[in-house]
């Protein structure tokens, strides 16, 4: 049974179908959000380029307290190819501004759509 | 329980200064980095300082880059934001933050108003 159970595992996700699973929480965050998201939470901006899964997961992983972005901080985990821990600013090549989180998603957000119909999986 | 209290707003005029603190209790003061944020009449939350745990790393906005300066005392757990050649943009209700945290944590804010 345990070998069996081995088959029934799933394979690696596709690029192209995490990105859509990450843009998907991230539009049902936005959605769903009655109170300000992680209630005016700041965290640090981050550049839209290069290195950005990284940069946003040490960005959001110093929220605590914030059911409402766990998940999306456990998909953007898989998208970093280094562990990532909170107090951590490697990705974070400049500490310019701070925002709210829920303005935080909503950039990313609209980043990571752009990406997705350019075809820019990874 | 995390508590803070800031003071030191108040009326002033253009070109003028204040200096505005936050009294912190409830955590260990000297662990954490802190902010101050603002919120203008009718707008949303606008940060505008940052300071880390030991006071030696500092942040700010572009719109106050300058003219504030943020600084704290550990001995004191008290967190300060100098603010000189202040403007009417300036007004707003002040807030210091400990990083990271829901304005459910925050202070109840020091109103800060530059008029003639």
């Known amino acids: 049974l345990t070998c069996l159970g081995g088959f029934a595992s799933p394979g690696p996700v596709p690029p192209s179908t995490a990105l859509r699973e990450l843009i998907e929480e991230l539009v049902n965050i936005t959605q769903n959000q009655k109170a300000p998201l992680c209630n005016g939470s700041m965290v640090w901006s981050i550049n839209l380029t290069a290195g950005m899964y990284c940069a946003a997961l040490e960005s959001l992983i110093n929220v605590s307290g914030c059911s409402a972005i766990e998940k999306t901080q456990r998909m953007l985990s898989g998208f970093c190819p280094h562990k990532v821990s909170a107090g951590q600013f490697s990705s974070l090549h400049v500490r310019d501004t701070k925002i709210e989180v829920a303005q935080f998603v909503k950039d990313l957000l609209l980043h990571l759509k752009k990406l997705f119909r350019e075809g820019q999986f990874n | 329980e995390v508590q803070l209290l800031e003071s030191g707003g108040g009326l002033v005029q253009p070109g003028g200064s204040l200096r505005l603190s936050c009294a912190a209790s409830?955590?260990?003061?000297?662990?954490?980095?802190m902010d101050w944020v603002r919120q203008a009449p009718g707008k949303g939350l606008e940060w505008v300082s940052a300071?880390?745990?030991?006071?030696?790393?500092?942040y700010y906005a572009d719109s106050v880059k300058g003219r504030f300066t943020i600084s704290r005392d550990n001995s004191k757990n008290t967190l300060y934001l100098q603010m000189n050649s202040l403007r009417a943009e300036d007004t707003a209700v002040y807030y210091c933050?400990?990083?990271?945290?829901?304005?459910?944590?925050w202070g109840q804010g020091t109103l800060v108003t530059v008029s003639s």
């Open positions: 300071i880390g745990p030991t006071g030696r790393d500092t």
């Open positions: 409830g955590f260990t003061f000297k662990s954490y980095g």
């Open positions: 933050a400990k990083e990271y945290t829901p304005f459910d944590y």
